[in-house]
Amino acid sequence: IWELKKDVYVVELDWYPDAPGEMVVLTCDTPEEDGITWTLDQSSEVLGSGKTLTIQVKEFGDAGQYTCHKGGEVLSHSLLLLHKKEDGIWSTDILKDQKEPKNKTFLRCEAKNYSGRFTCWWLTTISTDLTFSVKSSRGSSDPQGVTCGAATLSAERVRGDNKEYEYSVECQEDSACPAAEESLPIEVMVDAVHKLKYENYTSSFFIRDIIKPDPPKNLQLKPLKNSRQVEVSWEYPDTWSTPHSYFSLTFCVQVQGKSKREKKDRVFTDKTSATVICRKNASISVRAQDRYYSSSWSEWASVPCS
Amino acid sequence: RNLPVATPDPGMFPCLHHSQNLLRAVSNMLQKARQTLEFYPCTSEEIDHEDITKDKTSTVEACLPLELTKNESCLNSRETSFITNGSCLASRKTSFMMALCLSSIYEDLKMYQVEFKTMNAKLLMDPKRQIFLDQNMLAVIDELMQALNFNSETVPQKSSLEEPDFYKTKIKLCILLHAFRIRAVTIDRVMSYLNAS
């Protein structure tokens, strides 16, 4: 048993039929010695008396909020949560496997630049009675600070008959140098509690591997005289690391017809302009990627040809 | 993805082209190692990230762009002697770059060159003949070192009398390639920055 936060404890259980469970001793936080009684989840059934209560925790029926009382007055509470281990594997019932980039991916993270700021998100089909807390560090044996905000519900989506809830959190490495070469990964740890069930999820990554620039900005077309060609120009996104001559981007320019089946023309360039042929009803899109380290491409920025 | 090949103008900062070739070569070699050594721990998640130049060179700090010198997190061990020799500077005056930066890059290349050559000698003795270092990568390292044109003592190639452990050698190759790729990215960024200065 270990303390998750004040008055909240996690009991780790091997989960199989007729498992013996864990013996837990609860102590009432009071100077009182006599006349103390214990209840579970504010039911009227008295579980025991005395300053300590010994319980055998085997299943969810044994978890919950234990309260010690004296003469109708509440003295203290202890909330017991369960962390299930089945066949040697901790349960992952609360979050959805996003299966990208590989199976058992519960947390996904992205950074818009090398500033040490990143966002992580996760999915669940659970709508209420759910709390998350997020911790992060650089490295694990001698951890360096990363500060994370509170996880918030960032999106709700309908998937077939079911609703899916996306939560996200923003974190910032306390002392990040954008030019640094990372040798220790960022560790992100999410504690998830659904009713009386506790689970934890982790992700480990280098900022360089989760970079996804914002789309190029100010995408503009300039028709070239007496030609079907246009000069497309754009700028680095505002959120990208500076100086741009050090943190350089490369770009992909795509001409796409109205129909998805039409052949796409693609040009790759390190410049912030390109000359392409603009077909009728087509659109021109540009996306960006770190020029030297091939992490994710940005989303497309698009303009119509007309 | 193949990085776009830049054809430098005669007046262009001469090392940019070489550094781009270096990054392309090390990225290709790393990809080849990952594929060939698929049953070895050779991915970024699996390996220990070791830097053989740690405490010997200070490339990141020495080559920091001026704009980042205001960032205290980047300044833990910043040296500030501004000098401008080395042929890559091609008589450009620059307040950003110091000889320390280019010589630090040169020292990095020299260290990796020695390590790779030693390792290749071991890999050539492997009866499985599973993987060898790409000669192109070694050549590109050499070309960039020549372009940098720093004179320094030759580091003797390490020779080892004991029987090589080929499994360990291949793991070390992965570690080395990952670290060298990261350093090659830094070198490319530096050269790009210098070229724009």
Partner: antibody
Framework: EVQLVQSGAEVKKPGASVKVSCKAT????????IEWVRQAPGQGLEWMGG????????NYNEKFKGRVTMTADSSTNTAYMELRSLRSDDTAVYYC??????????WGQGTTVTVSS | EIVMTQSPATLSVSPGERATLSCKAS??????VAWYQQKPGQAPRLLIY???NRYTGVPDRFSGSGSGTEFTLTISSLQSEDFAVYYC?????????FGGGTKVEIK
């Protein structure tokens, strides 16, 4: 002892509103959700929504959104469920129940609402 | 929305016999399932929560099992006071949903 006591039966005309109360005693009101469940004559149970006074959260069944409002008064430990624009098919017994970790463990006695012109 | 489907709709059993009631969820609800008993003119009464945990004061002839999408309520030896309607309910994801109910009647 935990108890949930509901207000008495109501007869309403179509288009009118009804507000049912549920007074909770014997436990810390703020620690639990009060859920509202209805049962039309001879039918099964249908969940309408819930209200947590502790967190100020509501959780409504989409089917009743816009027509139902759930509130509470912590000074009297009383929860309320108001249903507007009543129709004849809203004729049912309306139950309040407390919920936290163990399902809906205590229920009110039910309030019969009859909608008839 | 998660749909809970109970079967059979009616179960005719003699006193002293075993009754097995089934409940299927349209998607996984982990073990967040409760079972309720309702007698005519009364409010429902909680029997089982977290799929297999007997609520305080519920006789041990009642037992629940299952996780994911398939759940079972078993009454090992029916007593006269057990003839009633039984509902399963998921509170894994909102909107909470009840099954249509299984009426256990005297054979």
């Amino acid at each position: 002892e935990v108890q949930l006591v509901q207000s008495g039966a109501e007869v309403k005309k179509p288009g009118a509103s009804v507000k049912v109360s549920c007074k909770a005693t014997g436990y810390t009101f703020n620690d639990y959700w009060i859920e509202w469940v209805r049962q039309a004559p001879g039918q099964g149970l249908e969940w309408m929504g819930g209200f947590s006074h502790g967190s100020g959260s509501t959780n409504y069944n989409e089917k009743f959104k816009g027509r139902v409002t759930m509130t509470a008064d912590s000074s009297t430990n009383t929860a309320y469920m108001e249903l507007r624009s009543l129709r004849s098919d809203d004729t049912a017994v309306y139950y309040c129940a407390r919920r936290r970790f163990r399902g809906m463990d205590y229920w009110g006695q039910g309030t019969t609402v009859t909608v008839s012109s | 929305e998660i749909v809970m489907t109970q079967s059979p709709a009616t179960l005719s059993v003699s006193p002293g016999e075993r009754a097995t009631l089934s409940c299927k969820a349209s998607q996984s609800v982990s073990n967040d399932v409760a079972w309720y008993q309702q007698k005519p003119g009364q409010a429902p009464r909680l029997l089982i929560y977290y799929a297999s945990n007997r609520y305080t004061g519920v006789p041990d002839r009642f037992s629940g099992s299952g996780s994911g999408t398939e759940f079972t309520l078993t009454i090992s030896s029916l007593q006269s006071e057990d003839f009633a309607v039984y509902y399963c309910q998921q509170d894994y994801s909102s909107p909470w949903s009840f099954g249509g109910g299984t009426k256990v009647e005297i054979k």
